[in-house]
C-alpha cells in the first residue's frame, strides 16, 4: 500500500513538475526590466527564451520573436536546449511511469517489469528536473552578470548634459516557476526510485533444511548461488533493490519472477 502511494505521489509530483517546466519554457518573463532606477517607466520590457516583449503606456503589449538562430547568445541556446531536453525526458518518463503504476493493470505485466519501468521513469524525472534547474540557473547567472555589467556603465553621458539610463534586467517569474518545477520533478523522480524498491519481487523465505546423508553429519544449506537461482538463506524479508539507483544492466542481473520455482 505504501509503495503504491509513494509511486502514485511520485507520479503526480513529477507530472506537476513537468507541467511547470513546460510552462516556464513557454513563458515570456524570464527576465524583466529592473525598475529600481525608473519605477515610473511607461514602457516595460521583458524577455523569454523565444521572444521579447514591450508593454507600452497604452497597455498594449508587443512581442517579437527571435527570428534568428545564429545571432542568439550561446548561453541562451544552451538554456533552450536544457529546457527542451528536460521536457522530452520528462514526457518520456511520464509515459513510462503510467504503465509502471501499480494501480494500473496492463495485461499480465510482471512486478519486476513494473519495478524496472518505475526505476527508469524515476531516473528520467531526476535528469529532467536537473536539466530544468540547470537551465534556469544558467539563465539566472547570465542575468546577474549582465546586471552588474550594465550597472558599471549605467549612466552614459549624452553631449555631457543629458543622462541616459541603460535598461537593466532582473529575474522574471519564469525563473522561479522553473526552479520550483525542476525541484518537484526531481523529488518526484526520487519518490519513483524509492517506490521501485518496494515494487521489486520479494525473496521467498526458505528455511535452511538439514539433509542427513548416511555417515555424514554435514548440513547443506542452499544459498550459495543466490545470484543465479534467486534462492537465499535469509529468514527476514529483504527487498532486492537495496540501492535504488542501479543501472539498468545491474537491475537485469537480479532475479525476476521467472527464476523462482
Amino acid at each position: 500500500m505504501a509503495v503504491t502511494a509513494c509511486q502514485g505521489l511520485g507520479f503526480v509530483v513529477s507530472l506537476i513538475g513537468i507541467a511547470g517546466i513546460i510552462a516556464a519554457t513557454c513563458m515570456d518573463q524570464w527576465s524583466t526590466q529592473d525598475l529600481y532606477n525608473n519605477p515610473v517607466t511607461a514602457v516595460f520590457n521583458y524577455q523569454g527564451l523565444w521572444r521579447s516583449c514591450v508593454r507600452e503606456s497604452s497597455g498594449f503589449t508587443e512581442c517579437r520573436g527571435y527570428f534568428t538562430l545564429l545571432g542568439l547568445p550561446a548561453m541562451l541556446q544552451a538554456v533552450r536546449a536544457l529546457m527542451i531536453v528536460g521536457i522530452v525526458l520528462g514526457a518520456i518518463g511520464l509515459l513510462v511511469s503510467i504503465f509502471a503504476l501499480k494501480c494500473i493493470r496492463i495485461g499480465s505485466m510482471e512486478d519486476s517489469a513494473k519495478a524496472n519501468m518505475t526505476l527508469t521513469s524515476g531516473i528520467m524525472f531526476i535528469v529532467s528536473g536537473l536539466c530544468a534547474i540547470a537551465g534556469v540557473s544558467v539563465f539566472a547567472n547570465m542575468l546577474v552578470t549582465n546586471f552588474w555589467m550594465s550597472t558599471a556603465n549605467m549612466y552614459t553621458g549624452m553631449g555631457g548634459m543629458v543622462q541616459t539610463v541603460q535598461t537593466r534586467y532582473t529575474f522574471g517569474a519564469a525563473l522561479f516557476v522553473g526552479w520550483v518545477a525542476g525541484g518537484l520533478t526531481l523529488i518526484g523522480g526520487v519518490m519513483m526510485c524509492i517506490a521501485c524498491r518496494g515494487l521489486a519481487p520479494e525473496e521467498t523465505n526458505y528455511k535452511a533444511v538439514s539433509y542427513h546423508a548416511s555417515g555424514h553429519s554435514v548440513a547443506y544449506k542452499p544459498g550459495g548461488f543466490k545470484a543465479s537461482t534467486g534462492f537465499g538463506s535469509n529468514t527476514k524479508n529483504k527487498k532486492i533493490y537495496d540501492g535504488g539507483a542501479r543501472t539498468e544492466d545491474e537491475v537485469q542481473s537480479y532475479p525476476s519472477k521467472h527464476d523462482y520455482v
Epitope: 514602457v43 520590457n45 524577455q47 521579447s52 507600452e56 497604452s58 497597455g59
Partner: antibody
C-alpha cells in the same frame, strides 16, 4: 470605429468635486489603458493619470495625487475621472485618451471652477 | 519628470513652405528593449482634441499625409512638414511616452504668414 464620448461641461465652485465620464465604443474596452489629460486655457497639455480596465490598477501624476480618482465600469465600457478640492487653476478641458499610441481622444469636457 | 522643450513656440509660414519643429527631452526616450524612441507628435486645432500624427519618433499614423515626417533619437527630435497645406496651420505638441508622468512640450503654433 473607435470612439470616446465624454460627459457635458461642468461649472463648479472652489472646493467642490467634479466627476467626468468617458464612454468607449468600437473596441474591446479592457484591451487598453484609459488615460486622462487636461488642457488649461492657453497652456500645454497635462497628463493626469491612467487606469488599467482589466484590474483597476491606476497611476497618477504626483501633482494630482490625493485629489484625483480614476475608476472604470467595465460592464458599461465607461471610465470616470473625479477631481476633488477644486481650485480656479483646475479650470480646463479634460480629455480621456486610449488605444495604442494614445491615438483616440474624447471630444473633451470643459470644467470651469469659479466662485 | 522628463521635461519636453519645443522650439520655436510660434512660427509663421506660407503654403508650400517646408517647416521644421524641434523637440528636446531632458532624458533619453530610447527604449533598448525594442530599439524604439518613445516620442509622439500631435496636431491640435482650436476647440478640438489633439490628433495623433507620429509615434515612435518617426512612424506615421495611418491616414496622416506623407508630407509629415518625424526623425531623431535619444533626446533630440524633429517634426518636418515638407510642403505646408492650408489645413496644416495648427498647434503641434511633442509628448514623452516613455516615462510617467507622460509629459508634453509647450507646443508650436504654426500660423499663416
Amino acid at each position: 470605429q473607435v470612439q470616446l464620448v465624454q460627459s457635458g461641461a461642468e461649472v463648479k465652485k472652489p472646493g467642490a468635486s467634479v466627476k467626468v465620464s468617458c464612454k468607449a465604443s468600437g473596441y474591446t474596452f479592457t484591451d487598453y489603458n484609459m488615460h486622462w489629460v487636461r488642457q488649461a486655457p492657453g497652456q500645454r497639455l497635462e497628463w493626469i493619470g491612467y487606469i488599467n480596465p482589466n484590474n483597476g490598477g491606476t497611476s497618477y501624476n504626483q501633482k494630482f495625487k490625493g485629489r484625483v480618482t480614476i475608476t472604470v465600469d467595465t460592464s458599461a465600457s465607461t471610465a470616470y475621472m473625479e477631481l476633488s478640492s477644486l481650485r480656479s487653476e483646475d479650470t480646463a478641458v479634460y480629455y480621456c485618451v486610449t488605444t495604442r499610441y494614445l491615438a483616440v481622444w474624447g471630444q473633451g469636457t470643459t470644467v470651469t471652477v469659479s466662485s | 519628470d522628463i521635461q519636453m522643450t519645443q522650439s520655436p513656440s510660434s512660427l509663421s509660414a506660407s503654403v508650400g513652405d517646408r517647416v521644421t519643429i524641434t523637440c528636446r527631452s531632458s532624458q533619453s526616450l530610447f527604449n533598448s528593449g525594442n530599439q524604439k524612441n518613445y516620442l509622439t507628435w500631435y496636431q491640435q486645432k482650436p476647440g478640438k482634441a489633439p490628433k495623433l500624427l507620429i509615434y515612435w519618433a518617426s512612424t506615421r499614423e495611418s491616414g496622416v499625409p506623407s508630407r509629415f515626417s518625424g526623425s531623431g533619437s535619444g533626446t533630440d527630435f524633429t517634426l518636418t512638414i515638407s510642403s505646408l497645406q492650408p489645413e496644416d496651420f495648427a498647434t503641434y505638441y511633442c509628448q514623452n511616452d516613455y516615462s510617467y508622468p507622460l509629459t508634453f512640450g509647450g507646443g508650436t503654433k504654426l500660423e499663416i504668414k
